[in-house]
C-alpha cells in the first residue's frame, strides 16, 4: 500500500522535511502532490511525469519544494503555514490512481531560558522563594530540575503560572542546590543555567570525629569537628576548659595517658552570630601488641586436607577472637576452635574455604585485628561443561566449542575428536564443517597441581536432513488438575524451527498451553484427562523437517463421584439383589461395599441373592484411587417389600 | 496551448477497418496519455482506450479488445486509433483527447466514421 | 467496471436560474470526477476536474462538489452560451466511464 512517511513529523521552523514515499508503483506515468487531505487542483503544488522527466509547478508551488524521481518531496525553509496533510496522487501506466496522504506539524525554535528569583539569600525556615523561568513562550511545555533530577514531591514546593513558577515554601538548607529550568515542545528542549539557591543556616550542634573516645598510647590523636553552617563556621578547641586552638582540626601526635580528659570543639556562624559547642571524653590506654596468623598448611587439597590456623602471640588471660570473611565465625561441624580459641582447626577444606581470615586479641580498650589470611584451596578440575549444548549442525557452518571446569590452578584443556587427541586449548575451531566432522568431542580437564583429570564427551551430528526428534518429559504420570508437564522437544540444533501437533492437529489456543525456549518446549499447566493424547513434535530448516515418534500422556484422574446401577431402590423380598458400582479413574479404582455401616466386600459388584426385608438399608460404594492418592463414595438406599 | 488535430471523415463497408490518426501541437506529445472516445449518434461518450506515448503502453476498454490497437509515433508526434471488422453500429464521431494528472482535458475536434454497405 | 449515472437526463430552465446535476457512481472513486461541456458539431470542454477544481478559462458561475460516489455540477446563473449536454466521468479506474449526459434546453 503506497504510504507517506514524514521525516520529521514535527518540523522545526527554517529547516526542512522530507515527506517520503513508500511502496511506489512500478511502471509510473506520474505523480502530483497536493496540499490537503484530497486531490484539488487549486492546492496542486508540483506535478511530475515521469517520460518527460519534468516537473510542473501547481498554484499551491511555493519555490521552496523540490520533487524527486522517487516521487517523495522536500521542503525548504518550513514555515508555520505548512503545518497540516499533504496528499501524493500517482497514476499508473495502466491510468489506474492511487493516492496516499502524510502530515507534519510546524513548531518553532525554543530560545535558551533563564531563571530569576525573588530572594537570592533566604533563611531557612523563615523565608520563601519563587523562582521564574523566563520568557514566556505560547505552546511550550515548563519543567523543572533540582540538581539533574525531576522534582522530588513535597508539599513545600508548588509549580504555578502554567508550571513556569516553582515556590519553596519555608525554605531548608536541603533545598540548597543547582535548579534549571526546561522549556519544551516537539522540535527543540533548552534548559537554563544553573541557579544555586544559597539558603543561610546554623551552626548546628557540633560533630566531632572519630566517635571513639578510647585511644592507645602512643598512638596519634586527630580530632576533627564539624557543625552544619552556611556561610560555614569558625571553629575553637578547649582542653579541659583551657583553649587550644582556632581550627578545625586538633592534632596531638604520640598520646600519652595525661592526654586523657575533656575536649570540647565550639562552632561560630559570623552571619548569624550563634555559638554552639560539644563536648567529648577521651581515655588513653596503655598499648597490647599486633597480633598475626600462622598457618600449617599453605595449599590444601579440597576434601582431603585440614588447615589449623593460630593466632600468635600467645598472651596469658587474653580473650581470641576469629573473622571468617568479615563476619564471626558459622556454627559448622568442620570448624573447631581449641580451648583457649587460639586456633582454628578447618576438617576437610572446600574451595568455598578461602577466606579471607582474621584473628583478633581483645583488650578492655578495643580488639586488635590482625592482617587478613587467605587459603590457596586446591580442587578440580569439575566434570567440564561444553557450550554451546548443540548436538546437531548443518554442514558449512562453523563450529566453535568451548570447555570449562572449575578449578584451582586454573585446568589445562586437551580436545580428542574420536579418541584422537586434537590441541591443547580450552576452545575448538573448526570452519565450514562437513559431515566428516561428526563424532564424539571429548573435552579432557587436567589439574597439574592435584593431578586430577575430569572429562566430558559430546556427539556431535553434521547433517543436511534433520535427525528425527524424540519427546522428552519432566513427569510421566501427571495428575489432573495438580500436576504441570513439560515436554522438551530433543535435540537442540542451531537454526531450527520446532513445531508440535497434538492428535495430529496443530496446538489448540489455550491459557494452559504454553511455548517456550524457542518453541523447544511445550508446557501444560493443570492437565486434565482431556490432555490424555498423543504429542509429536517436529523440526525443520530450509533443508530438511522431521517428526518425533508420538508421546502419549497418562493423566491420573480420579476416582470421580461413583455410580451404582441398577438405579432401583426398591425390591420384592426373595429376588437377588446385583449392585454393579462405576468411577471413572486412571489407573482404575479400587471398590469397597459397606452397608449400613459395615464393610462388606473389595469388589465392584456385590451380589445378594434371595434378599429379605432384613436387607433394607443403606449401600454406599467407596472408591480409591492409589495414584491420586484420591477418594470418593456414593450412599444408596435399598427398600426390600415382603 | 495544446492542440490536437485528427484526420478527415471516412465511409467505409463493414467488415473492413478504420485508422484514424491524432497530431499534437502546441506541447509536448509525450507528457501526457492520449485517449480515444466516441459518440455514436443519439449515444453517450464512450471510452475505448488510451496510450502513453513515451513507452507505447496502452490500454483498452473490454468491449473494444480485439478489435482495436492504438499505436503512437513519437517523431511525428502522432497517435493512431486502428478499429477493425467494422459494422453499421461503429458510426460514430471519434475523439482523441489528451490525459494528464486530471483525466482528459483537451480534445482534438473530432473524426467521422460512417460504416455503411 | 464503475457505472456512472446522471440526472436528470435532460432539463429545461431560464438564462439567470441556478441549475444542479447530479451524478453518481456505482463505488467510490474518491475525487476522480471531471465535467464537460458538449455543444453539437463541437468537442467535449473540461469545466470541472478532480470533483471541485475550475478549469483555467471556465467562468466561475461553474462549480463542482462531491466526494465518494455522489457529485454535483452547479451553474450559478445560467447564460444563453451554457445551453449544452453537460457530461460527468470518472478516472478513478483506468476504464474511464461517462455519465449518459444531461441535455439542458431553453425554456
Known amino acids: 500500500k503506497l504510504t507517506i512517511e514524514s521525516t520529521p513529523f514535527n518540523v522545526a521552523e527554517g529547516k526542512e522535511v522530507l515527506l517520503l514515499v513508500h511502496n511506489l508503483p512500478q511502471h509510473l506515468f506520474g505523480y502530483s502532490w497536493y496540499k490537503g487531505e484530497r486531490v484539488d487542483g487549486n492546492r496542486q503544488i508540483i506535478g511530475y511525469v515521469i517520460g518527460t522527466q519534468q516537473a510542473t509547478p501547481g498554484p499551491a508551488y511555493s519555490g521552496r519544494e523540490i520533487i524527486y524521481p522517487n516521487a517523495s518531496l522536500l521542503i525548504q525553509n518550513i514555515i508555520q503555514n505548512d503545518t497540516g496533510f499533504y496528499t501524493l496522487h500517482v497514476i499508473k501506466s495502466d491510468l489506474v490512481n492511487e493516492e496516499a496522504t502524510g502530515q507534519f506539524r510546524v513548531y518553532p525554535e525554543l530560545p535558551k531560558p533563564s531563571i530569576s528569583s525573588n530572594n537570592s539569600k533566604p533563611v531557612e525556615d523563615k523565608d520563601a522563594v519563587a523562582f521564574t523561568c523566563e520568557p514566556e513562550t505560547q505552546d511550550a511545555t515548563y519543567l523543572w530540575w533540582v540538581n539533574n533530577q525531576s522534582l522530588p514531591v513535597s508539599p513545600r514546593l508548588q509549580l504555578s503560572n502554567g508550571n513556569r513558577t516553582l515556590t519553596l515554601f519555608n525554605v531548608t538548607r536541603n533545598d540548597t542546590a543547582s535548579y534549571k529550568c526546561e522549556t519544551q515542545n516537539p522540535v527543540s528542549a533548552r534548559r537554563s543555567d544553573s541557579v544555586i539557591l544559597n539558603v543561610l543556616y546554623g551552626p548546628d550542634a557540633p560533630t566531632i570525629s572519630p566517635l571513639n573516645t578510647s585511644y592507645r598510647s602512643g598512638e596519634n590523636l586527630n580530632l576533627s569537628c564539624h557543625a552544619a553552617s552556611n556561610p560555614p563556621a569558625q571553629y575553637s578547641w578547649f582542653v579541659n576548659g583551657t583553649f587550644q586552638q582556632s581550627t578545625q582540626e586538633l592534632f596531638i601526635p604520640n598520646i600519652t595517658v595525661n592526654n586523657s580528659g575533656s575536649y570540647t570543639c565550639q562552632a561560630h556562624n559570623s552571619d548569624t552570630g550563634l555559638n554552639r559547642t560539644t563536648v567529648t571524653t577521651i581515655t588513653v590506654y596503655a598499648e597490647p601488641p599486633k597480633p598475626f596468623i600462622t598457618s600449617n598448611n599453605s595449599n590444601p587439597v579440597e576434601d582431603e586436607d585440614a588447615v589449623a590456623l593460630t593466632c600468635e602471640p600467645e598472651i596469658q588471660n587474653t580473650t581470641y577472637l576469629w573473622w571468617v570473611n568479615n563476619q564471626s565465625l558459622p556454627v559448622s561441624p568442620r570448624l573447631q576452635l581449641s580451648n583457649d580459641n587460639r586456633t582454628l582447626t578447618l576438617l576437610s577444606v572446600t574451595r568455598n574455604d578461602v577466606g579471607p581470615y582474621e584473628c583478633g586479641i581483645q583488650n578492655e580498650l578495643s580488639v586488635d585485628h590482625s592482617d587478613p589470611v587467605i587459603l590457596n584451596v586446591l580442587y578440580g578440575p569439575d566434570d567440564p561443561t561444553i557450550s554451546p549444548s548443540y548436538t546437531y549442525y548443518r554442514p558449512g557452518v562453523n563450529l566453535s566449542l568451548s570447555c570449562h571446569a572449575a578449578s584451582n590452578p586454573p585446568a589445562q584443556y586437551s580436545w580428542l575428536i574420536d579418541g584422537n587427541i586434537q590441541q591443547h586449548t580450552q576452545e575448538l575451531f573448526i570452519s565450514n564443517i562437513t559431515e566428516k566432522n561428526s563424532g564424539l568431542y571429548t573435552c579432557q580437564a587436567n589439574n597439574s597441581a592435584s593431578g586430577h583429570s575430569r572429562t566430558t564427551v559430546k556427539t556431535i551430528t553434521v547433517s543436511a536432513e534433520l535427525p528425527k526428534p524424540s519427546i522428552s518429559s519432566n513427569n510421566s504420570k501427571p495428575v489432573e488438575d495438580k500436576d504441570a508437564v513439560a515436554f522438551t522437544c530433543e535435540p537442540e540444533a542451531q537454526n531450527t524451527t520446532y513445531l508440535w501437533w497434538v492428535n495430529g492437529q496443530s496446538l489448540p489456543v489455550s491459557p494452559r498451553l504454553q511455548l517456550s525456549n524457542g518453541n523447544r518446549t511445550l508446557t501444560l499447566f493443570n492437565v486434565t484427562r482431556n490432555d490424555a493424547r498423543a504429542y509429536v513434535c517436529g523440526i525443520q530448516n530450509s533443508v530438511s523437517a522431521n517428526r518425533s515418534d508420538p508421546v502419549t500422556l497418562d493423566v491420573l484422574y480420579g476416582p470421580d463421584t461413583p455410580i451404582i446401577s441398577p438405579p432401583d431402590s426398591s425390591y420384592l423380598s426373595g429376588a437377588n439383589l446385583n449392585l454393579s458400582c462405576h468411577s471413572a479413574s486412571n489407573p482404575s479404582p479400587q471398590y469397597s461395599w459397606r452397608i449400613n455401616g459395615i464393610p462388606q466386600q473389595h469388589t465392584q459388584v456385590l451380589f445378594i441373592a434371595k434378599i429379605t426385608p432384613n436387607n433394607n438399608g443403606t449401600y454406599a460404594c467407596f472408591v480409591s484411587n492409589l495414584a491420586t492418592g484420591r477418594n470418593n463414595s456414593i450412599v444408596k438406599s435399598i427398600t426390600v417389600s415382603a | 496551448q495544446v492542440q490536437l488535430v485528427q484526420s478527415g471523415a471516412e465511409v467505409k463497408k463493414p467488415g473492413s477497418s478504420v485508422k484514424v490518426s491524432c497530431k499534437a501541437s502546441g506541447g509536448t506529445f509525450h507528457d501526457g496519455a492520449i485517449s480515444w472516445v466516441r459518440r455514436a449518434p443519439g449515444q453517450g461518450l464512450e471510452w475505448m482506450g488510451h496510450?502513453?506515448?513515451?513507452?507505447?503502453?496502452?490500454g483498452y476498454a473490454q468491449k473494444f479488445q480485439g478489435r482495436v490497437t492504438i499505436t503512437a509515433d513519437e517523431s511525428t508526434s502522432t497517435a493512431y486509433m486502428e478499429l477493425s471488422s467494422l459494422r453499421s453500429e461503429d458510426t460514430a464521431v471519434y475523439y482523441c483527447?489528451?490525459?494528464?494528472?486530471?483525466?482528459?482535458?483537451?480534445w482534438g475536434q473530432g473524426t467521422l466514421v460512417t460504416v455503411s454497405s | 467496471d464503475i457505472q456512472m449515472t446522471q440526472s436528470p437526463s435532460s432539463l429545461s430552465a431560464s438564462v439567470g436560474d441556478r441549475v444542479t446535476i447530479t451524478c453518481r457512481a456505482s463505488?467510490?472513486?474518491?475525487?476522480?470526477l471531471n465535467w464537460y461541456q458538449e455543444k453539437p458539431g463541437k468537442a467535449p470542454k473540461l469545466l470541472i476536474y478532480a470533483a471541485s477544481s475550475l478549469q483555467s478559462g471556465v467562468p466561475s458561475r461553474f462549480s463542482g462538489s462531491g466526494s465518494g460516489t455522489d457529485f454535483t455540477l452547479t451553474i450559478s446563473s445560467l447564460q444563453p452560451e451554457d445551453f449544452a449536454t453537460y457530461y460527468c466521468q470518472q478516472w478513478r479506474s483506468h476504464l474511464f466511464t461517462f455519465g449518459q449526459g444531461t441535455k439542458l434546453e431553453i425554456k
Open positions: 483527447a489528451r490525459y494528464r494528472f486530471y483525466g482528459i482535458d483537451y
Open positions: 463505488q467510490s472513486i474518491s475525487s476522480y
Open positions: 496510450i502513453i506515448p513515451i513507452d507505447g503502453t496502452a
